[in-house]
């Protein structure tokens, strides 16, 4: 979990800086005796592996790329995101409101821990490690953190249950503004995501080390209570569970009950009237659908490399070195994978939504609020040209599809 | 002034056992983490062990592993060697060394023959 | 185990010309606290080794201005600005980045 364990007695517990957000650098300690570290006096030191040194060096300089790239990146698409979101009425609507909350919660990262790492990276060692500033830092990297990946996970959660939602109550009319229960969810997901963060805020500590008769410090999770200890234990596991496979389960069992929903409402002149409502909206749930893909794909290497170095990777075998290459090589992907993701949500939108497309260039273009004829021509919230029932007063068919604006 | 002063060495033979001292003086013995290297006859310089500050710590090179015990005692500022099993190929002269981020103090040293 | 390799062996130089030793490492010596902890020492003949530049390029106290160390990664150089007859020995190179530390094979240095 982050540089340096213990002090004086490490000899297993150490985690070079697994934060979890992509930027962890939990290999570098964590699977071998780190050399900068002390170790027990009985001096089990194990035989060094080579290639660690080599994996290391190549990737603190690949990774200050690609964080930087995905600093600048993530910046501007995330912050462009939230700028087309705020400043567009119709744009205001469930889904984009769930899409701007993940946007905020990817800003909020990329703004604030990417730097941190990238220093941590660059400069080997804590910022600000002598100093009150420092131990805030240090606290406050893996919350943020933690509460990063909790928003983008239950972000992608909730529009999976909104895209279920969508389908499922057809009867419900609802204007342009974004409803209270995704205003209620957002609130809450944030507030979750805080929570589960909190013990990385308490088990992150400056902790004093030593190296050849100098000491250093660094920010660590350092264990102190019952609590604490447990969480470390089943960190890894905990992370996959609940940052990784259920917001597949969700998308999963969502998009099935969905599916069905649809495949019921087949037939019927109600399905005839709403086929282009309907399109648009199996659109929205494709974007969806594509969000969690990158999500899974970003994440899935980073998780696998944990989950292996948990159960197959033993640190006594004296042939460990090939599998220690192998997963260090596969952490760091996936490290830079998982910070990718951050990033990629606003480029995956511009490529999936031609309504987000047209706003980005637009908005990027400085103009998207004054471009009325884009506004007219293409409509922004996806089914805002209403299906009409002849009966003006029907609200069981007149569906506003605030919803479905995403395409 | 810092001065160290190894003593221990003499001759043993094969399999023997031996242990040598290096007394530190001049400085704070506590706050420096120490080493030991040996240089065979007409050889160049080979680093044997190191002990972290507090002596909880101790690292060995592979030649050595198993066989020699690096150690310390703070209360007399004194560092210790252990050398079991010994061969003819650790026949050296062993400096100690303080540790501050680099070796910047060493003893005059003491020469260990391993010799039936 | 990380091999420190030196070059050239022996040199032999004149009084007040520089002179230059090399060394490389088998692999980057960046240690992760970001130090890269590899040191000069001089063995006068007769005489324990003693430290002239230490983390790469700074000299330790009492070490004449003419020692300057340099280099990154895998390549680190000692440079004498003019040689006195007093820095004849032997050079050694030494990473203390990763267990085992490792010298190098040493670099004799004599006066013309």
């Known amino acids: 979990d982050n540089p340096e364990r213990y002090s004086t007695n490490l000899s297993n517990h150490v985690d070079d800086f697994t934060t979890f957000r992509g930027t962890e650098l939990s290999f570098l300690v964590t699977t071998h005796q780190p050399t900068n570290l002390v170790l027990p006096s009985n001096g089990s030191m194990h035989n060094y592996c080579p290639q660690q040194t080599k994996i290391t060096s190549a990737f603190k300089y690949i990774n200050t790329v690609i964080s930087c790239t995905i600093f600048i990146v993530g910046m501007v698409g995330n912050a462009t995101l939230l700028r087309i979101i705020y400043q567009n009425k119709c744009m205001r609507n469930g889904p984009n409101a769930l899409i701007a909350s993940l946007a905020l919660g990817d800003l909020i990262y990329v703004v604030i821990d990417l730097p941190i790492n990238v220093f941590k990276l660059l400069a080997g060692r804590w910022p600000f490690d002598h100093n009150d500033f420092g131990v805030f830092l240090c606290k406050l990297f893996p919350f943020l953190q933690k509460s990063s990946v909790g928003i983008t996970v239950l972000n992608l959660c909730a529009l999976s249950v909104d895209r279920y939602r969508a389908v499922a109550s057809w009867s419900r009319v609802q204007g342009i503004g974004i409803p209270l229960v995704t205003a209620i969810e957002i609130v809450s997901i944030w507030i979750l995501s805080f929570i589960l963060a909190i013990p990385e805020a308490i088990g992150f500590v400056m902790v004093p080390f030593e190296y050849r008769g100098e000491q250093h410090k660094t920010c660590m999770l350092n264990a102190t209570s019952k609590f604490m200890e447990f969480y470390q234990d089943v960190k890894d596991w905990w992370l996959f569970g609940f940052y990784f496979c259920m917001p597949l389960v969700c998308t999963a069992i969502f998009y099935t009950l969905m599916t069905c929903e649809m495949l019921n409402r087949r037939n019927g002149s109600l399905r005839i009237a709403l086929s282009e409502h309907l399109k648009q909206r199996r659109e929205v749930a494709k974007t969806v659908f594509c969000l969690v893909v990158i999500f899974a794909l970003c994440w899935f290497p980073l998780h696998l490399s944990r989950i292996l170095k948990k159960t197959v990777y033993n640190e006594m075998d004296k042939n460990r070195c090939e599998l220690l290459s192998f997963l260090l090589l596969m952490d760091y992907i996936g490290i830079n994978l998982a910070t990718m993701n951050s990033c990629i949500n606003p480029i995956a939108l511009y490529f999936v939504s031609k309504k987000f497309k047209n706003c980005f260039q637009s908005c990027l273009c400085c103009c998207c609020y004054q471009s009325k004829s884009l506004m007219t021509s293409v409509p922004m919230n996806g089914t805002s040209i209403q299906w009409k029932n002849h009966d003006q007063n029907n609200h069981n068919t007149d569906r506003s599809s605030h919803k479905d604006s995403m395409n | 002034e810092v001065q160290l002063l190894e003593s221990g060495g003499g001759l043993v033979q094969p399999g023997g056992s031996l242990r040598l001292s290096c007394a530190a003086s001049g400085f704070t013995f506590s706050s420096y983490g120490m080493s030991w290297v040996r240089q065979a006859p007409g050889k160049g310089l080979e680093w044997v062990s190191a002990?972290?500050?507090?002596?909880?710590?101790?690292y060995y090179a592979d030649s050595v592993k198993g066989r020699f015990t690096i150690s310390r005692d703070n209360s007399k500022n004194t560092l210790y060697l252990q050398m079991n099993s010994l061969r003819a190929e650790d026949t050296a002269v062993y400096y100690c060394?303080?540790?501050?981020?680099?070796?910047?103090?060493w003893g005059q040293g003491t020469l260990v023959t391993v010799s039936s | 185990d990380i091999v420190m390799t030196q070059t050239p062996l022996s040199l032999s130089v004149t009084p007040g010309q520089p002179a230059s030793i090399s060394c490389r490492s088998s692999q980057n010596i960046v240690h992760s606290t970001g130090n890269t902890y590899l040191e000069w020492y001089l063995q006068k003949p007769g005489q324990s080794p003693q430290l002239l530049i230490y983390k790469v390029s700074n000299r330790f106290s009492g070490v004449p201005d003419r020692f300057s160390g340099s280099g990154s990664g895998t390549d680190f150089t000692l440079k004498i600005s003019r040689v006195e007859a007093e820095d004849v020995g032997v050079y050694y190179c030494?990473?203390?980045?990763?267990?085992?530390?490792?010298f190098g094979q040493g670099t004799k240095v004599e006066i013309k």
């Open positions: 060394a303080t540790e501050k981020g680099a070796m910047s103090h």
């Open positions: 030494f990473q203390g980045s990763h267990f085992p530390f490792t």
């Open positions: 002990i972290s500050t507090n002596g909880a710590t101790a």
